[in-house]
């Protein structure tokens, strides 16, 4: 516990004090107090450098002396023979002696008292930076006028912080500036600007003049910039040693000016102002930037349009420019878009079509449709080679978007008809010579495919059944051949406007308009044993003459059963209308007179017997295209007869073209549009 | 019309072979296609087997495979199943059928022919 | 092979009745299916083909319905001729094969 005074006397003083004793006193007065330590009493056995016995006084680390010997005042008034005064408020004394003493030493009679010490003048570093004023037991620093005192309580600075400048434009120097500046002072200035404008500081060489740097290079009095995470500086020195246009790149700065103890010059002065955050000019490959300009600051806006062929794409959309926004913090709004190759995606099938599997979808990639060969066509032209355009469509040169269409070939038999022996007379077929054969099994009869839709036939095939059940593909009727074929389901059965629809069609004698379509469900698949026949043309070039050869098929009646299990077929000529009128009818159901004959209907047959007959009906009469020699188009319809194995009547197609167009148009769907 | 004429009853050891003959009447052979099916007695319909004459081949039952034989005699309008290695099992009345048209299974079926196996 | 199971294997009922047989295919048979009158001594009769035509000269109180594995014959009004043994058949492949029976008697 620290002590105003105090004493310290050696061991049995004022007896002799004995032999080899080490014994230590620990001083400590108050805080702010020195020791004034002063001996009245010295009696110990002298030695060089007092080696033997001694009183020793350590201040610190320091030794304040070392006593031995005997000393007497040289004041008759004062007792004092030795005294040490430190400006410190701890001491040490020890006291040691030897083994062996000649004569006998009394040893030391010691007083210690707090004295007041100076902190102003008694030390080599002054404690104040600029007044200190001592007191007992301690010391405070005052500053001069316009000065603080710093929070360590020692410094003065002067109050040069907390301006925070915010206009755009402004000039700040060090303080008195151009005078000296303050010693040991930091001052610091803010400069805010509104986000979107960075500081630009200037400067001019001879406006800046601080204290130089040590021979380290560290400055001592220094001028420092901070913007962000950026510093420009520490500069210091006789003119201004950095850049004298400093573009900070932010809205904020810091400017710190720290000066030390010494060394005071004139100071710095600097101007600065507020431009735009200027925004680089980006190379954002494939697109143009629209307004184009040298250089780009905050709120500036520009379109960046991508190329032709490329498209930008943000979520599942795809557009073809955007806008950028330079922003406050010196970058572009919509920074990640970017224009990116348009994509046309995976092609679109097309129906009875194939398109190869691209090795890119990418702008400018080019693709091609087929069609299922030999059996469809495409109809709407184009070569089906289609290319990635930059709308991200699949472009064909003469189609545009639009997709190619496959349709079935018409009238060409995968194998053409041989007849092989001696219908009625007819020979066995094979249903590739005639794919377009269609059986109806109630009532027993036959139809002809004109397209994937549609199935051509007598009207008085469907008269009595507006359901009717049909196949395609097989050449024997057979059940389990049929099970193995493709069953037709109808839509809607079609007959001509101009057929009499009668109470008791098996006494019928007028044939006239003997054709109806029927509208089938689903489309119906192309194959080898699948294909529609051609319709005729409108030009006279399809007008029958006499002796013209044609094909029919069917199921119909033969010499020797009622009804052919096999496909049969017969190649007749035309004849003259006449030469059925002629014919005797069979059984009839009615006066000969009463049968119509018509310009809409075809007279054929009449040699070796070949003939159609019962169930063969709406089966066609197969003519060769004319202008098309590997085709066959429908010149005609089974229709009726006078008596099998002579000549039969057929349905002059060619008469009702505008009608099956019609038909098939007002009732076609979207599917096949 | 068609008439379908069969051979008669038969009376087999077991091991043995039988070969019933269906002729065909009022018609070609080879207009048609011949199915032959059985029935052991008390039990129900079983089909054997056919000749598919638009590919030419015969297609038999699983069950009967490598046991039955069935072949056509065009110039007779004849049709012949053999069914070999006889079993008790194999006692049944064996008919012969035509295939019908147009959905129709089967047209006319023989009066059939009843074969015993017994030892 | 398509398998055709045939229910109920026996069906005791009166002369008036409505009676109702069906049959289920292992697998889908689209409408190729008949239906057959067997009496004891004679070779089965065919009544119904296409799953639902009526075979010509057999009374209208024969009926068959259905299409891809569900079928059904019925026999609105039983007259005391009907008592029988009816068949199902499917002819959708080559390989024929017949329901196991459904034996119609008197109660």
């Known amino acids: 516990e620290p002590t105003m005074y105090g004493e310290i006397l050696s061991p049995n003083y004022p007896q002799a004090y004995p032999s080899e004793v080490e014994k230590s006193w620990d001083i400590e007065v108050p805080e702010g107090y020195g020791i004034h330590l002063y001996f009245t009493h010295l009696d110990i056995e002298l030695s060089e450098n007092c080696a033997y016995d001694s009183v020793q006084i350590i201040s610190g680390d320091t030794e304040e002396g070392r006593l031995c010997g005997q000393r007497s005042s040289n004041n008759p008034h004062s007792p004092i023979v030795e005294e040490f005064q430190v400006p410190y408020n701890k001491l040490q004394v020890i006291f040691k002696s030897d083994f062996s003493n000649e004569e006998r030493f009394t040893g030391f009679a010691a007083y210690y008292v707090a004295t007041d010490i100076n902190e102003c003048t008694d030390f080599v570093d002054v404690p104040c930076s600029h007044f200190c004023n001592n007191f007992i037991g301690g010391y405070f620093c005052s500053c001069p006028p316009e000065y603080f005192l710093h929070d360590d309580m020692k410094n003065c600075g002067v109050n040069c912080s907390g301006d925070v400048f915010t206009a755009l434009i402004g000039e700040i120097a060090s303080p008195n500036y151009p005078k000296p500046y303050p010693e040991n002072s930091r001052c610091e200035y803010q400069i805010r600007l509104e986000k979107g404008f960075q500081v630009v500081v200037t400067l001019r060489r001879e406006d800046f003049d601080v204290e130089a740097a040590d021979s380290a290079g560290n400055c001592l009095d220094s001028l420092v910039f901070v913007a962000g995470d950026r510093q420009f500086g520490p500069y210091c020195g006789h003119g201004f040693p950095g850049p004298l246009n400093i573009e900070t790149k932010s809205n904020a700065l810091d400017i710190i000016f720290q000066t030390d103890l010494t060394g005071q010059k004139k100071g710095w002065k600097l101007r600065y102002h507020g431009d735009p955050m200027p925004c680089p000019k980006e190379d954002t490959p494939n697109s143009v930037w629209e307004p184009a300009k040298a250089k780009y600051v905050f709120r500036d806006v520009v379109q960046i349009t991508c190329l032709d062929g490329f498209e930008v794409v943000e979520g599942r959309v795809g557009a073809t420019s955007f806008y950028s926004t330079c922003q406050s913090n010196g970058k572009w709004s919509n920074s990640k878009l970017k224009c990116q190759p348009v994509d046309c995606g995976i092609p679109e099938s097309i129906e009875n079509g194939k398109v190869e599997d691209p090795e890119s979808t990418l702008f400018g990639s080019v693709i091609r449709y087929t069609c299922e060969e030999p059996y469809y066509y495409m109809e709407n032209g184009g070569g089906g080679e289609y290319h990635c355009a930059g709308n991200g469509s699949w472009v064909n040169e003469v189609l545009g978007p639009e997709l190619p269409k496959c349709v079935p070939v018409c009238g060409v038999p995968r194998e053409p008809f041989e007849e092989k022996q001696r219908i009625i007379g007819g020979s066995d077929a094979d249903i590739k010579n005639f794919p377009w054969q269609v059986f109806f099994d109630n009532p027993w009869a036959g139809g002809a495919l004109i397209n994937e839709y549609w199935v051509l036939t007598a009207a008085h095939v469907v008269e009595g059944n507006r359901e009717p059940t049909m196949y395609v593909g097989s050449t024997s009727v057979q059940t389990s051949r049929l099970a193995k074929s493709k069953m037709l389901t109808p839509e809607h059965v079609f007959i001509h406007p101009g057929w009499k629809l009668l109470e008791v069609p098996e006494g019928r004698t007028n044939f006239d308009n003997d054709i109806a379509l029927v509208r089938l469900k689903d489309p119906v698949k192309m194959g080898p044993t699948v294909s529609p026949i051609c319709l005729p043309g409108t030009s006279s070039d399809y007008n029958l003459m006499d002796g013209d050869l044609g094909l029919i098929s069917g199921w119909g009646r033969t010499e020797k059963r009622d009804r052919a299990v096999r496909l049969k077929a017969a190649r007749l000529p035309v004849a003259p209308l006449r030469k059925c009128k002629e014919v005797k009818v069979e059984k009839p159901t009615a006066d000969a007179e009463a049968y119509v004959f018509t310009p809409n209907m075809i007279c054929a047959g009449g040699e070796k017997g070949m003939d159609s007959c019962k169930g063969d009906s709406g089966g066609a009469f197969a003519v060769q295209d004319p202008n098309d020699k590997t085709k066959f188009y429908a010149a005609g319809l089974v229709s009726w007869g006078p008596q099998c194995g002579t000549y039969g009547l057929y349905t002059r197609v060619k008469n009702y073209v505008d009608w099956i167009m019609k038909t098939m148009q007002e009732n076609s769907t979207p599917r096949e549009d | 019309q068609v008439q379908l004429v069969q051979s008669g009853a038969e009376v087999k050891k077991p091991g043995a072979s039988v070969k019933v003959s269906c002729k065909v009447s009022?018609?070609?052979?080879?207009?048609?296609?011949m199915h032959w099916v059985r029935q052991a007695p008390g039990k129900g319909l079983e089909w054997m087997g056919t000749?598919?004459?638009?590919?030419?081949?015969?297609i038999y039952a699983q069950k009967f495979q490598g046991r039955v034989t069935m072949t056509e005699d065009t110039s007779t309008d004849t049709a012949y199943m053999e069914l070999s290695s006889l079993r008790s099992e194999d006692t049944a009345v064996y008919y012969c059928?035509?295939?019908?048209?147009?959905?129709?299974?089967?047209?006319?079926w023989g009066q059939g022919t009843l074969v015993t196996v017994s030892s | 092979d398509i398998q055709m199971t045939q229910s109920p294997s026996t069906l005791s009922a009166s002369v008036g009745d409505r009676v109702t047989i069906t049959c289920r295919a292992s697998?889908?048979?689209?409408?190729?299916l008949a239906w057959y009158q067997q009496k004891p001594g004679k070779a089965p009769k065919l009544l119904i083909y296409?799953?639902?035509s009526l075979e010509s000269g057999v009374p209208s109180r024969f009926s068959g319905s259905g299409s891809g594995t569900e079928f059904t014959l019925t026999i609105s009004s039983l007259q005391p001729d009907d008592f029988a043994t009816y068949y199902c058949?499917?002819?959708?492949?080559?390989?024929?094969?017949f329901g196991q029976g459904t034996k119609v008697e008197i109660k």
């Open positions: 059928v035509t295939e019908g048209l147009a959905g129709r299974p089967y047209d006319v």
């Open positions: 009022g018609d070609t052979l080879t207009e048609l296609s």
């Open positions: 000749f598919d004459p638009e590919e030419g081949e015969t």
């Open positions: 697998q889908s048979i689209s409408s190729w």
């Open positions: 296409k799953a639902s």
């Open positions: 058949q499917q002819y959708n492949s080559y390989k024929l094969t």
